[in-house]
C-alpha cells in the first residue's frame, strides 16, 4: 500500500490585508486512521491553527466538508488577514492514538507573506538636453512591494538594454521595499521618436509587469546645419537668397539676417516643415535690392538653436554684370 | 535494525543534573515519538514523558514538571533526558522507549539499554 | 492519575504451565491496555498492546484480553525464558502508568 503524502502544492502564497487567504492541503491516502490538523511555524513553539475536534477558530473555515467519509481535501481558509498572520502554515496528519493522537506526517509547509503590488514605475530623464552621440542617464523608481524578490529590465524602442544599475531598499527585513535604477543611453540622431521602457515584473502582478516610459525627445538636443544659397532668378532689382536649417531638435529657433554685419529688420518668408524622425526643417527666403552701387554683399543668416550658442553661415552675393544691367533696365 | 543506543552510567550528588542521550538508528527519527521510562532499583516501570522529534514538543508528567527537559537534535537523531535538582530518590535505570507504529495505545516497541544514574552524596 | 494493580504479585511455575496474570484500571481505560516482559538487567519487550493485540514476534503462546478495568495476560504453555516479571500499563490518559508487576518465577 503506498504510503500517504501531504501535499501542499504553494510554497509561496501572498495575500493582502484583510483578504481572505486560502491554504491547500490534500492527502494521497485515507489510512493511517486519525485527523489533520494545521499548525504555523515549527518546533515546540508552533501554533495550532485549526483542529476539527476541538477547539475555537472563528476565522478558520475549511474549503471541504472534514465529516465526509472519504474526503482527502483539508484545505482551510483564513478571513481577514493581518500582518500577524505572515508564517509558514503546515498541514500535519495524525494518527489516531490514546491518550493522544500521534504525529504521523506533515505537508511541506506553504510561506504565507503580505503581498503589496509595486506602484507604477516613474522614469524621470536628465535635467538639460545633450546632443547625439552623448550618453545620458534615465532613473525609474518604484515602491512599496512586497515580498523583496523584483525584476526590472529597460528598453529602448523594443530593444533590452545592459547598462543599468539597480538597488532594492532596504537590504534587510521590511513590510515594504523600494526598487530605483539608473540605466545609461547613448543618444542617436534619430532618437526624437524613441522611447525608454522601464518594465517592472513582481510576484503580485501575476506575469503581467508593470511599465513607466519616457520620451527621449526630452533628453535630446539635434544642433541644425546651416546652407545659405543665393537662387539663380532674379525678381526684378531682387535676388533671393535662401538660408536652409536642418534636421534640428527641439523647434524652439531664432533666425537673424545680416546684410554686410547689419542685422536686418525687414519681414522674411520662412517655412517649418517637420521630418519623419521627428527633427524640423526650416526655410528662411531674404530678398535682397540690387543696384550698380552694390559690389560686394555678404549675407549672414545666424542661428540660435534652444538657447545654444548663435551658429552662422554667410554667402557673398554673386551679382554678375548681366544681372546689374538687368536690374538698372529694370529701374524706372 | 532499529536501535536506541543511551549514553552511558552516571553518578551525581544531590542537587546537581544529569543529561541522558538516547541516539536512534535504522529508522526514520522524526516519524515516532520517544519516550522516557525510569526504574528504581527493584522497583517498577515510572512514565516521565515524551518529546515529539519532528516539532520538538514534550509532555510530562506533572510529578517532573519543572525537572525534567527533554530535547532533540535531528541532525544526530538523538533525543535528551535532562533532569535537574536531582535527589538520592531519583537513583533509577533510566530509559528512552520509540512509541509503537501500529498501536492506538501508547505502547513502546523499541527500548533503550537503560542509562544507571547513581544520586549519591 | 489512573491506578493500575496486578494480581499476583508473583506467582511459581512449572514448564508447560498456562499462566494468567490479571490487570486491573481504577477507571475504564476501554483497550488501551499493553502487556511487557522483562528480564533482569535488560529493558521490557512489549508482548500485547490494544489489550489483545500480538506485537510482531511475540510466540502465539501469549495472549491478552479485556476491556474497560479488568484485563488478562494468558500464557497458554510456560517456556523455560517466560520466567521473568509482567507489566501491564495503560494508556488511556496522560501520565501514562504502569501495573507493580508480576514475578513469574520456576516452581
Known amino acids: 500500500e503506498e504510503e500517504l503524502q501531504m501535499i501542499q502544492p504553494e510554497k509561496l502564497l501572498l495575500v493582502t490585508v484583510g483578504k481572505t487567504a486560502t491554504l491547500h492541503c490534500t492527502v494521497t491516502s485515507l489510512l493511517p486512521v486519525g485527523p489533520v490538523l494545521w499548525f504555523r511555524g515549527v518546533g515546540p513553539g508552533r501554533e495550532l491553527i485549526y483542529n476539527q475536534k476541538e477547539g475555537h477558530f472563528p476565522r478558520v473555515t475549511t474549503v471541504s466538508d472534514l465529516t465526509k467519509r472519504n474526503n482527502m481535501d483539508f484545505s482551510i481558509r483564513i478571513s481577514s488577514i493581518t500582518p500577524a498572520d505572515v508564517g509558514t502554515y503546515y498541514c500535519v496528519k495524525f494518527r489516531k492514538g490514546s491518550p493522544e493522537n500521534v504525529e504521523f506526517k506533515s505537508g511541506p509547509g506553504t510561506e504565507m507573506a503580505l503581498g503589496a503590488k509595486p506602484s507604477a514605475p516613474v522614469v524621470l530623464g536628465p535635467a538639460a538636453r545633450t546632443t547625439p552621440e552623448h550618453t545620458v542617464s534615465f532613473t525609474c523608481e518604484s515602491h512599496g512591494f512586497s515580498p523583496r524578490d523584483i525584476t526590472l529590465k529597460w528598453f529602448k524602442n523594443g530593444n533590452e538594454l545592459s547598462d543599468f544599475q539597480t538597488n532594492v531598499d532596504p537590504t534587510g527585513q521590511s513590510v515594504a521595499y523600494s526598487i530605483r535604477s539608473t540605466a545609461r543611453v547613448v543618444l542617436d540622431p534619430w532618437d526624437v521618436r524613441s522611447q525608454v521602457i522601464c518594465e517592472v515584473a513582481h510576484v503580485t502582478l501575476q506575469g503581467d509587469p508593470l511599465r513607466g516610459t519616457a520620451n527621449l525627445s526630452e533628453a535630446i538636443r539635434v544642433p541644425p546645419t546651416l546652407e545659405v544659397t543665393q537662387q539663380p532668378m532674379r525678381v526684378g532689382n531682387q535676388v533671393n537668397v535662401t538660408c536652409q536649417v536642418r534636421k534640428f531638435y527641439p523647434q524652439s529657433l531664432q533666425l537673424t539676417w545680416s546684410e554686410n554685419g547689419n542685422v536686418c529688420q525687414r519681414e522674411t518668408a520662412s517655412t517649418l516643415t517637420e521630418n519623419k524622425d521627428g527633427t524640423y526643417n526650416w526655410t528662411s527666403w531674404f530678398l535682397v535690392n540690387i543696384s550698380d552701387q552694390r559690389d560686394d554683399v555678404v549675407l549672414t543668416c545666424q542661428v540660435k538653436h534652444d538657447g545654444q550658442l548663435a551658429v552662422s553661415k554667410r554667402l557673398a552675393l554673386e551679382v554678375t554684370v548681366h544681372q546689374k544691367d538687368q536690374s538698372s533696365d529694370a529701374t524706372p | 535494525q532499529v536501535q536506541l543506543v543511551q549514553s552511558g552510567a552516571e553518578v551525581k550528588k544531590p542537587g546537581a543534573s544529569v543529561k541522558v542521550s538516547c541516539k536512534a538508528s535504522?529508522?526514520?527519527?522524526?516519524?515516532?515519538?520517544v519516550h522516557w521510562v525510569r526504574q528504581a532499583p527493584g522497583q517498577g516501570l515510572e512514565w516521565m514523558g515524551r518529546?515529539?522529534?519532528?516539532?520538538?514538543?514534550?509532555n510530562t508528567a506533572q510529578k517532573f514538571q519543572g525537572r525534567v527537559t527533554m530535547t532533540r537534535d535531528t541532525s544526530t537523531s538523538t533525543v535528551y533526558m535532562e533532569l535537574s535538582s536531582l535527589r538520592s530518590e531519583d537513583t533509577a535505570v533510566y530509559y528512552c522507549?520509540?512509541?509503537?507504529?501500529?498501536?492506538?495505545?501508547?505502547?513502546?516497541?523499541?527500548w533503550g539499554q537503560g542509562t544507571l544514574v547513581t544520586v549519591s552524596s | 492519575d489512573i491506578q493500575m494493580t496486578q494480581s499476583p504479585s508473583s506467582l511459581s511455575a512449572s514448564v508447560g504451565d498456562r499462566v494468567t496474570i490479571t490487570c486491573r484500571a481504577s477507571?475504564?481505560?476501554?483497550?488501551?491496555l499493553n502487556w511487557y516482559q522483562q528480564k533482569p538487567g535488560k529493558a521490557p519487550k512489549l508482548l500485547i498492546y490494544d489489550a489483545s493485540s500480538l506485537e510482531s514476534g511475540v510466540p502465539s503462546r501469549f495472549s491478552g484480553s479485556g476491556s474497560g478495568t479488568d484485563f488478562t495476560l494468558t500464557i497458554s504453555s510456560l517456556q523455560p525464558e517466560d520466567f521473568a516479571t509482567y507489566y501491564c500499563?495503560?494508556?488511556?490518559?496522560?501520565?501514562?502508568?504502569f501495573g507493580p508487576g508480576t514475578k513469574v518465577d520456576i516452581k
Open positions: 477507571q475504564s481505560i476501554s483497550s488501551y
Open positions: 500499563q495503560q494508556a488511556n490518559s496522560f501520565p501514562l502508568t
Open positions: 522507549a520509540r512509541l509503537g507504529d501500529v498501536a492506538v495505545a501508547a505502547s513502546f516497541d523499541y
Open positions: 535504522g529508522y526514520t527519527f522524526t516519524r515516532n515519538y
Open positions: 518529546i515529539n522529534p519532528n516539532s520538538g514538543g514534550t
